[in-house]
């Protein structure tokens, strides 16, 4: 769970399940970041990627976009694939809310997801053989 | 808020505040993703980045790592900076839990954060590879 210091003046802090369950206000702070248009780096990158829609109605957010690198190599100045380099996904662990019961929409559980956000071009690891 | 279909058999679904507040179980599902070894792409990328620690005890997760691109240009084969292209941050919107009251650790609010996860190398020309 989350180990926050507990204040004696708070109701239910002695509850044996605390901090197993917490109350979460779903009126999102900083909601306006939603209005930004998605970046077009996916197309201009030397390691371009496609975005795939991952949808799950039992999860919040229900739609998550996942990146899949278009090429194994990276795009060079001439627009050809250079296989001496690799396009690799940059992954991030995110928190989502998973509905605990299909029937009761007000009870959730935190879930970790590993999502690919975009791709970057890396030099391959050269293995030196003795 | 989150618009999930409401089941008539669920307690409190008629509450005028629903679905303003929900109960969240903090025993995280898929916790084991935490054990994965951090990638070294940040160092091997043609658009390398540094990771900066963003810490906030009133937030869960309290520590978030943010990427800052090391260079304006991208690193070429010789290890020099190529200013014909740019290193740019790949940003993602994530959900975090923000403590609503400093004193009561069991009441939270969802908050959106825009974080830079890593960097990619972009060109001014979109190359379409057959």
């Amino acid at each position: 769970g989350i180990a926050f210091p507990q204040n004696p003046g708070c109701r239910n802090t002695e509850d044996k399940n605390f901090p197993q369950h917490v109350k979460v206000n779903l009126n999102i702070l900083n909601r306006n970041t939603n209005s930004r248009r998605p970046s077009d780096y996916y197309n201009r990158s030397t390691s371009p990627w496609n975005l795939h829609r991952n949808e799950d109605p039992e999860r919040y957010p229900s739609v998550i976009w996942e990146a899949k690198c278009r090429h194994l190599g990276c795009v060079n100045n001439e627009g050809n694939i250079n296989y001496h380099m690799n396009s690799v996904p940059i992954q991030q662990e995110i928190l989502v809310l998973r509905r605990e019961s299909q029937h009761c929409p007000h009870s959730f559980r935190l879930e970790k997801m590993l999502v690919a956000v975009g791709c970057t071009c890396v030099t391959p690891i050269v293995r030196h053989v003795a | 808020g989150i618009a999930f279909p409401q089941n008539p058999g669920c307690r409190n679904t008629e509450d005028k505040n629903f679905p303003q507040h929900v109960k969240v179980n903090l025993n995280i599902l898929n916790r084991n993703t935490n054990s994965r070894r951090p990638s070294d792409y940040y160092n091997r990328s043609t658009s390398p980045w540094n990771l900066h620690r963003n810490e906030d005890p009133e937030r869960y997760p309290s520590v978030i790592w943010e990427a800052k691109c090391r260079h304006l240009g991208c690193v070429n084969n010789e290890g020099n900076i190529n200013y014909h292209m740019n290193s740019v941050p790949i940003q993602q919107e994530i959900l975090v839990l923000r403590r609503e009251s400093q004193h009561c650790p069991h009441s939270f609010r969802l908050e959106k954060m825009l974080v830079a996860v890593g960097c990619t190398c972009v060109t001014p020309i979109v190359r379409h590879v057959a």
């Epitope: - | 014909h84 292209m85 740019v88």
Partner: antibody, heavy 118, light 110 residues
């Protein structure tokens, strides 16, 4: 279609301040570095300042360093130029431009005239 | 800072070809892209060549750009000149800290 619309120009006394805005549309604003370029009456183009797509990096011409501040609000698709301690030689049409990459100004606005005079 | 030097003016007849040069005073021109902008009287600049030799969509193929590393200079060539090509043309390049424009060349189509 890329559109850049500058506003905020006008007449100001030497030593005064002005804030220019550039409203952008038709492209992914946060993906692009943005620049301000000016043109004094009857003269050539002079680069003033630039800012990275995320807003984390800013750059200035020596002639305006310490007096002008570039910023952006990606949630509003707007670029700003805060101009302080204005001088007569700052009189110019100020253009905002979208950079394809750093130093490559691909699209320009129509400009806004700033006149510094007593 | 480096400087970009252009001829003050050039003139040529319709249908002919004209070349405008742009010389970089210091730092290798090959390390940084060169752009060319057209500015008609009373209008904003528009890009006609970017990344040394790339033409944005909508710019006719009569416009071409090139660089010559040996002379550290760039050139804009306009073939099949038309009266609407009459304008000021600015070259532009950059380094990691600044962006520089040439002084501009006034093209007159006779």
């Amino acid at each position: 279609e890329v559109q850049l619309l500058e506003s905020g120009g006008g007449l100001v006394q030497p030593g005064g301040s002005l804030r220019l805005s550039c409203a952008a549309s038709g492209f992914t604003f946060s993906s692009y570095a943005m620049s301000w370029v000016r043109q004094a009456p009857g003269k050539g183009l002079e680069w003033v300042s630039a800012i990275s797509g995320s807003g984390g990096s800013t750059y200035y011409a020596d002639s305006v360093k310490g007096r002008f501040t570039i910023s952006r609000d990606n949630s509003k698709n707007t670029l700003y130029l805060q101009m302080n301690s204005l001088r007569a030689e700052d009189t110019a049409v100020y253009y905002c431009a979208r950079d394809l990459i750093w130093g490559v100004a691909g699209s320009w606005g129509q400009g806004t005239l700033v006149t510094v005079s007593s | 800072n480096f400087m970009l030097t252009q001829p003050h003016s050039v003139s040529e007849s319709p249908g002919k070809t004209v070349t405008i040069s742009c010389t970089r005073s210091s730092g290798s021109l090959a390390n940084y892209y060169v752009q060319w902008y057209q500015q008609r009287p009373g209008s904003s600049p528009t890009i006609v060549i970017f990344a040394n030799n790339q033409r944005p969509s909508g710019v006719p193929d009569r416009f071409s750009g090139s660089i010559d590393s040996s002379s550290n200079s760039a050139s804009l060539t306009i073939s099949g000149l038309k009266t609407e090509d009459e304008a000021d043309y600015y070259c532009q390049s950059y380094d990691p800290h600044s962006v520089v424009f040439g002084g501009g060349t006034k093209l007159t189509v006779l």
